[in-house]
C-alpha cells in the first residue's frame, strides 16, 4: 500500500529519515502534528514486505494512519500516538528501524529530544508512558545458565514520571518471592536477579504506568542446567578423504564434553582376513592417544604423512568421559600418483576412486 500524495497533512509535517539498524531515533512532535517516519532499505537494497509496529502491536491503516513499505504517516497526532515504533521485515520480524515518538501538548520545535532514560516532570508536557529504548528490550527470551545473573530492562518515560512494577507469571513479584531476593533500579527501569536457579523460570512482565496510561512488556526466562552426558562429536567429522599416494592427510574430530574427555584415534585392521573379533568387536590399532604433553586440540587432529596404499581404510575418532563413549568414523581412499594414472590410462586401465 503506497502513501498517496493526495492525503492532506494536518499541522506541520516532520519527516524523519530512518536510523541505522540497531540504532534508535528519539523524536518529539507537537499535538496536531503529522508524524512521518521513514525507513529506507538498509544498504539501499530491496526492502521486501514490511510491517510497522507500535509498542509491539502491528499498526492497522486508517484514514489517520497511513502505512507504506518505507514510510509511516500518522496525521493529527495526539498523546495516544506516543510510543515505540519499528519497521520490521514481515517474514523474519527483523527490526529495520526503531523510533521513539513522544507527542506533547506544545507544538513541536522540530528538535529531537536528547536520549535520556529518565523523564522529568516539567509541568509542561504531559503524556502516557512510552518506551525510550526499545532496542534494549529486543531479547524477549533469555536462556541463562544457572548461577548467573539476569537483568530485565523496560526503559520508559512519561509525564508525570511513570511508576514501574513487576509481575512473575502474571502475579505481583517482590524480593521475598525468591531466595536471594531481587534488585530493583527504578532509575534504570530494571530488575536484576542474581544467581538464578530453575525455580526462577517463568514469564516476567514490567508494568509502566502513570495517570495517562499503562504499557507493559513480558520476557521469558529459561534457566539452563547441566545434564551430564557422554562426549558429543561434531556431525560430519571426521570426513571421508581421498588422497594421492605420497600426499599428506588430516582427519578432524571436534569433541564437546563437560567432563574431561579422553580422545583416541583408531585404525580398523584385519586379523586373519576378518575385520571383527568373535564377539563382534572390530579389530583396531591405536594411532594416537593422550600423552603427558598432548593437548586436547592436538588430539582432535590426526595427521598422516606420505600416505601409502596400506593407509587406506577406516579411521575412528573415539572420545570417552566418565559418563560414556562416542565415536565417529571416516574412510581414506588412496589413489595412485598422477604419473601412474597417466600410464594406466594409456594402457587402457581404469582406476575406481
Amino acid at each position: 500500500e503506497s502513501l498517496g500524495t493526495e492525503q492532506r497533512v494536518v499541522g506541520r509535517a516532520a519527516e524523519v529519515p530512518g536510523p541505522e539498524p540497531g540504532q534508535q531515533e528519539q523524536l518529539v512532535f507537537g499535538s496536531g502534528d503529522a508524524v512521518e517516519l521513514s525507513c529506507p532499505p538498509p544498504g539501499g537494497g530491496p526492502m521486501g514486505p514490511t510491517v510497522w509496529v507500535k509498542d509491539g502491536t502491528g499498526l492497522v491503516p486508517s484514514e489517520r494512519v497511513l502505512v507504506g513499505p518505507q514510510r509511516l504517516q500518522v496525521l493529527n497526532a495526539s498523546h495516544e500516538d506516543s510510543g515505540a515504533y519499528s519497521c520490521r521485515q514481515r517474514l523474519t520480524q527483523r527490526v529495520l528501524c526503531h523510533f521513539s515518538v513522544r507527542v506533547t501538548d506544545a507544538p513541536s520545535s522540530g528538535d529531537d529530544e536528547d536520549g535520556e532514560d529518565e523523564a522529568e516532570d516539567t509541568g509542561v508536557d504531559t503524556g502516557a508512558p512510552y518506551w525510550t529504548r526499545p532496542e534494549r528490550m529486543d531479547k524477549k527470551l533469555l536462556a541463562v545458565p544457572a548461577a548467573n545473573t539476569v537483568r530485565f530492562r523496560c526503559p520508559a518515560a512519561g509525564n508525570p514520571t511513570p511508576s514501574i512494577s513487576w509481575l512473575k507469571n502474571g502475579r505481583e513479584f517482590r524480593g521475598e518471592h525468591r531466595i536471594g531476593g531481587i534488585k530493583l533500579r527504578h532509575q534504570q527501569w530494571s530488575l536484576v536477579m542474581e544467581s538464578v536457579v530453575p525455580s526462577d523460570r517463568g514469564n516476567y512482565t514490567c508494568v509502566v504506568e502513570n495517570k495517562f496510561g499503562s504499557i507493559r512488556q513480558t520476557y521469558t526466562l529459561d534457566v539452563l542446567e547441566r545434564s551430564p552426558h557422554r562426549p558429543i562429536l561434531q556431525a560430519g567429522l571426521p570426513a571421508n578423504q581421498t588422497a594421492v599416494l605420497g600426499s599428506d592427510v588430516e582427519f578432524h574430530c571436534k569433541v564437546y564434553s563437560d567432563a574431561q574427555p579422553h580422545i583416541q584415534w583408531l585404525k580398523h585392521v584385519e586379523v586373519n582376513g576378518s575385520k571383527v573379533g568373535p564377539d563382534g568387536t572390530p579389530y583396531v590399532t591405536v594411532l594416537k592417544t593422550a600423552g603427558a604433553n598432548t593437548t586436547d586440540k592436538e588430539l582432535e587432529v590426526l595427521s598422516l604423512h606420505n600416505v601409502t596404499f596400506e593407509d587406506a581404510g577406516e579411521y575412528t575418532c573415539l572420545a570417552g568421559n566418565s559418563i560414556g563413549f562416542s565415536h565417529h568414523s571416516a574412510w581414506l581412499v588412496v589413489l595412485p600418483a598422477e604419473e601412474e594414472l597417466v600410464e594406466a590410462d594409456e594402457a587402457g586401465s581404469v582406476y575406481a576412486g
Partner: antibody, heavy 127, light 107 residues
Framework: EVQLVESGGGLVQPGGSLRLSCAAS????????ISWVRQAPGKGLEWVGR????????NYADSVKGRFTISADTSKNTAYLQMNSLRAEDTAVYYC????????????????????WGQGTLVTVSS | DIQMTQSPSSLSASVGDRVTITCRAS??????LAWYKQKPGKAPKLLIY???FLYSGVPSRFSGSGSGTDFTLTISSLQPEDFATYYC?????????FGQGTKVEIK
C-alpha cells in the same frame, strides 16, 4: 566458600613456555567462567582472557592472542593458562578470577563480572 | 579497544572524608562497569558491578553511579581500610579494559 588457587609461576627465559593452573572450588564451575588478569610490577591491571565453561568458548586480549591458550578440565574444576613465546613484557603477577555473566534483555552484550580472585602467581620472563 | 580514563590518578584524604573517583569510557559502555579495590601485594576485590550495584559484603559507604561514558565511585565516609588503589573496568566491549587506577592515600 569460593576459592581460587593459582600455581605454576616462576622464572622463564624469553621465548620459553609456562603453564599456570587455577584450582577452583565452591561454585558451579561448568555454569560460569574463569578470567585471567595480570599486573606488571608497579603497574595497573590488564585483562588477559576468559574461559566460559558453559560453551567452552575463550576470548583473549590482542597482546597475548596466538601465544596464550586458556583451557580447563571441568572434571577437576581447574583452568589453565598455557603461555608460549614469552616476552619480557609478560612479566607480571597473574590472577585468575571466578567470572559470572549478567544476561540482559539488551542483546548487545553479556556483562562479565569477576568477583572472586586468587592470590596470584608471579611469572618472570628474563634471560 | 575501549579506553578507560580515571581521575584523579591519586588523591590524599582523611578518615571521614567523602571521596569521589570518576571514570570515563572512550565510548558508550551502557552500565557495564565494575569498580575494584586493591591493596599492595593483594588481589583486587570487587566493590560495584553494573555501574551501581553494590556487591554482597561490601560496606554501604561505597556507591556507584553513571551510565554511558561517565561513571563515579563515591566513598561517603572514608575509613582506614579504604586507603588503597581503585580501578574501574568495562566489560561491554572486547577486550575488557581497566582504568589506570586511582590511589587513595592518607593526608
Amino acid at each position: 566458600e569460593v576459592q581460587l588457587v593459582e600455581s605454576g609461576g616462576g622464572l622463564v627465559q624469553p621465548g620459553g613456555s609456562l603453564r599456570l593452573s587455577c584450582a577452583a572450588s565452591g561454585f558451579p564451575f561448568t555454569s560460569q567462567g574463569i578470567s585471567w588478569v595480570r599486573q606488571a610490577p608497579g603497574k595497573g591491571l590488564e585483562w588477559v582472557g576468559r574461559y566460559w565453561a558453559w560453551d567452552g568458548s575463550t576470548n583473549y586480549a590482542d597482546s597475548v592472542k596466538g601465544r596464550f591458550t586458556i583451557s580447563a578440565d571441568t572434571s577437576k574444576n581447574t583452568a589453565y593458562l598455557q603461555m608460549n613465546s614469552l616476552r619480557a613484557e609478560d612479566t607480571a603477577v597473574y590472577y585468575c578470577a571466578r567470572t559470572y555473566g549478567i544476561y540482559d534483555t539488551y542483546d548487545k552484550y553479556t556483562e562479565y563480572v569477576m568477583d572472586y580472585w586468587g592470590q596470584g602467581t608471579l611469572v618472570t620472563v628474563s634471560s | 579497544d575501549i579506553q578507560m580514563t580515571q581521575s584523579p590518578s591519586s588523591l590524599s584524604a582523611s578518615v571521614g572524608d567523602r571521596v569521589t573517583i570518576t571514570c570515563r569510557a572512550s565510548q558508550d559502555v551502557d552500565t557495564s562497569l565494575a569498580w575494584y579495590k586493591q591493596k599492595p601485594g593483594k588481589a583486587p576485590k570487587l566493590l560495584i558491578y553494573s555501574a551501581s550495584f553494590l556487591y554482597s559484603g561490601v560496606p554501604s559507604r561505597f556507591s556507584g553511579s553513571g551510565s554511558g561514558t561517565d561513571f563515579t565511585l563515591t566513598i561517603s565516609s572514608l575509613q582506614p581500610e579504604d586507603f588503597a588503589t581503585y580501578y574501574c573496568q568495562q566489560s561491554t566491549g572486547h577486550p575488557q579494559t581497566f582504568g589506570q587506577g586511582t590511589k587513595v592515600e592518607i593526608k
